[in-house]
Interface confidence: low
Amino acid sequence: RRGAPAEDQDCGRLPDFIAKLTNNTHQHVFDDLSGSVSLSWVGDSTGVILVLTTFQVPLVIVSFGQSKLYRSEDYGKNFKDITNLINNTFIRTEFGMAIGPENSGKVILTAEVSGGSRGGRVFRSSDFAKNFVQTDLPFHPLTQMMYSPQNSDYLLALSTENGLWVSKNFGEKWEEIHKAVCLAKWGPNNIIFFTTHVNGSCKADLGALELWRTSDLGKTFKTIGVKIYSFGLGGRFLFASVMADKDTTRRIHVSTDQGDTWSMAQLPSVGQEQFYSILAANEDMVFMHVDEPGDTGFGTIFTSDDRGIVYSKSLDRHLYTTTGGETDFTNVTSLRGVYITSTLSEDNSIQSMITFDQGGRWEHLRKPENSKCDATAKNKNECSLHIHASYSISQKLNVPMAPLSEPNAVGIVIAHGSVGDAISVMVPDVYISDDGGYSWAKMLEGPHYYTILDSGGIIVAIEHSNRPINVIKFSTDEGQCWQSYVFTQEPIYFTGLASEPGARSMNISIWGFTESFITRQWVSYTVDFKDILERNCEEDDYTTWLAHSTDPGDYKDGCILGYKEQFLRLRKSSVCQNGRDYVVAKQPSVCPCSLEDFLCDFGYFRPENASECVEQPELKGHELEFCLYGKEEHLTTNGYRKIPGDKCQGGMNPAREVKDLKKKCTSNFLNPTKQNSKSNS
């Protein structure tokens, strides 16, 4: 039974773990006095880490800075000072280290240059930071270099003078392909989308920008939208918020063909002080937040159909503070269809909500077993778990980390939380779910940093404390039992845990510094758990697990979005290595269709607590404002449309008379009168 966690009790204490870990703990002391450290992993499964330390002394007129660059190729066990490879140059930390996609081995560091120089300077490596080439730029970069996802030799950057610069040879040579550019993004197939201002500046022309596209790295251009406020890419959708003709409101328009044709999204328009935000998007659908009028701090989540056009209201009073502000919206990547977020209730308290079906229905998080409701609860026996995420962190609550889940650690979600009627400002505890958020248990008392290793085979945690620490905790049974390991005799001021992205590694690096009266020294301890998980997992170590199972007796048990998935999961009792090549084994099976597998199409809605879609009464005999492609085609519907990503077959097929909606269609989206095609000579 999953109760409160046990630490070093009769909990299957691992034999000789202290000796095994001591032999696999590697200390590295950094011989510099830097004020900040940034760390980047280069490539996947390469073991290469770059560490940039910076030391800045602000003087009256200029600031004097010094950078040091270190490289490890054994997951952080040993580091080599490679500052000489960048000519001891001061690196601008605000640009970070631009690491190339996948395993390209490419790295770009942007250097600080003196005031009068013609352009910026970068150091480029294409061999996992073994060597760097210094390149002087013909412009001063405003943003970090952006790699094309399809070809890491193709780079784009904006200059401080709003020029759009492109390189086709990994930054060796650069060409300015357009001026007056406000925002630029890579799309699919090396397409670049960007907005330009026509009259004054990006800020002054907000709402009067043009959206352009180039498919050939700047040889030719096409204007694909006008009166643009902003644009974004999500999944296979291109979104633009477009100013209305009549007033200062704006509306979202959607394209699924890179801007050749647009449709107006069936979403409320927003005023000047409001905003739209794409919370999440995949190849099937999008979660869109629409801000409420006024400075409320909340809005509404809508989920789209497969075209990104028809939207269903998903969640009211969704917490989202301001444009670019804080939202707790979290995609639980360890289980399909699961998202967690926060709502702001009438009394201004914040409550966590979870959806298991991609936004179809939201509910409170189940109260962890054996937990007591805190002071926020009216009824001491009935309450729920509330998760601390970005908003709590921004409010400086004692929450060192956001919720954590990993696609290859199936079902595991770790988060800080409190148990009551709303999020509490009291010191939180750490909770874990092993089933994607259906059930929860307290994992650790008080705030901790945590990370997942070996695809869930090991969970590592470090207590969040303002005192120096020297203990790391780890669990090999998904957080039920914990062992403590003293990784150093000299406690350090802890600054962060670092493990290779993807949670496949068995190494964890503990970063911090030691401080004496005069000096501060950076230090890292890398602990390798390979000897704790001595053997490779075998077939017997895994057990099948039906995801989303809530009623094993029901033939539709586990059906989410038209199919169920059985996973092979490591038994909690098995202490073995999943290994770096571990692939999540899952067996999907299709479910029969029911009305739950369909959303309501244009002009239809579901009355409260009903499953059938009925025609919207206000549209009977009226014109439809929302139109596909702004034209009169494809406007027939039977009122239902399959939910994006739903794979159900057979069963219930909502058949009814097909209505012709062409007669009701009006769209006022102004596509550019003639979609200009231009050549860049």
């Epitope: 077993e369 059930s439 099948t544 094993p552």
Partner: antibody, heavy 129, light 107 residues
Framework: QVQLVQSGAEVKKPGASVKVSCKAS????????MSWVRQAPGQGLEWMGI????????SYAQKFQGRVTMTRDTSTSTVYMELSSLRSEDTAVYYC??????????????????????WGQGTTVTVSS | DIQMTQSPSSLSASVGDRVTITCRAS??????LNWYQQKPGKAPKLLIY???SLQSGVPSRFSGSGSGTDFTLTISSLQPEDFATYYC?????????FGGGTKVEIK
């Protein structure tokens, strides 16, 4: 309702093989493992092995390795246990038992702990010359 | 393999008595322990899983406790239908071994 129905009693000569069947009904066959347990006359229970009907993978107790084969037929929701090279000490009642280690139960408390919750009526196998 | 040792191997008790049976594992098995009841000529019946969780339909006079290596099955007030043999079984790692059994007889 959920039930497991086993084949009838068998009398075999030493050295022969026996194949016992266990037909499942009332639940999703591929969602639960199936264990086989035997009980010699006047003795205790002895676990022989387990099969995952979904993929057909098996795990046998060392004692029976090389002599036991567990298979399944998903079209008829039936699992089989075949024991070869029979000797007199194999005389026992053989049980199949549904083993929910292969499924997440509804409540969090039971999600990873489980027992063999449904048993067949048993098949008596007598080995005698 | 993990050895499961049950004690006593048999006991005599009267209706209404409180009965305790213990089971010890040769190594820690966390809470992966089940208890079964078997009556002559019948298949075993699951009583307790996960050391302390009562299987649905089992009377509440049966309870289980323990974790690690030492476990206990308690019948708070023995009823006539409770006279049977009781087995513990570990479900921690294969092979899923059983204890030798405890026969509860009428005094």
């Amino acid at each position: 309702q959920v039930q497991l129905v086993q084949s009838g009693a068998e009398v075999k000569k030493p050295g022969a093989s026996v194949k016992v069947s266990c037909k499942a009904s009332g639940y999703t066959f591929t969602s639960y493992y199936m264990s086989w347990v035997r009980q010699a006359p006047g003795q205790g229970l002895e676990w022989m092995g387990i099969i995952n009907p979904s993929g057909g993978s098996t795990s046998y107790a060392q004692k029976f390795q090389g002599r036991v084969t567990m298979t399944r037929d998903t079209s008829t929701s039936t699992v089989y246990m075949e024991l070869s090279s029979l000797r007199s000490e194999d005389t026992a009642v053989y049980y199949c038992a549904r083993d929910p280690s292969g499924i997440a139960a509804a409540g969090p408390a039971s999600r990873y702990y489980y027992g063999m919750d449904v048993w067949g009526q048993g098949t008596t196998v007598t080995v005698s010359s | 393999d993990i050895q499961m040792t049950q004690s006593p191997s048999s006991l005599s008790a009267s209706v209404g008595d409180r009965v305790t049976i213990t089971c010890r594992a040769s190594q820690s098995i966390s809470s992966y322990l089940n208890w079964y009841q078997q009556k002559p000529g019948k298949a075993p019946k699951l009583l307790i899983y996960g050391a302390s969780s009562l299987q649905s339909g089992v009377p509440s006079r049966f309870s289980g406790s323990g974790s690690g290596t030492d476990f206990t099955l308690t019948i708070s007030s023995l009823q006539p239908e409770d006279f049977a043999t009781y087995y513990c079984q570990q479900h921690y790692v294969g092979p899923f071994t059983f204890g030798g059994g405890t026969k509860v007889e009428i005094k």
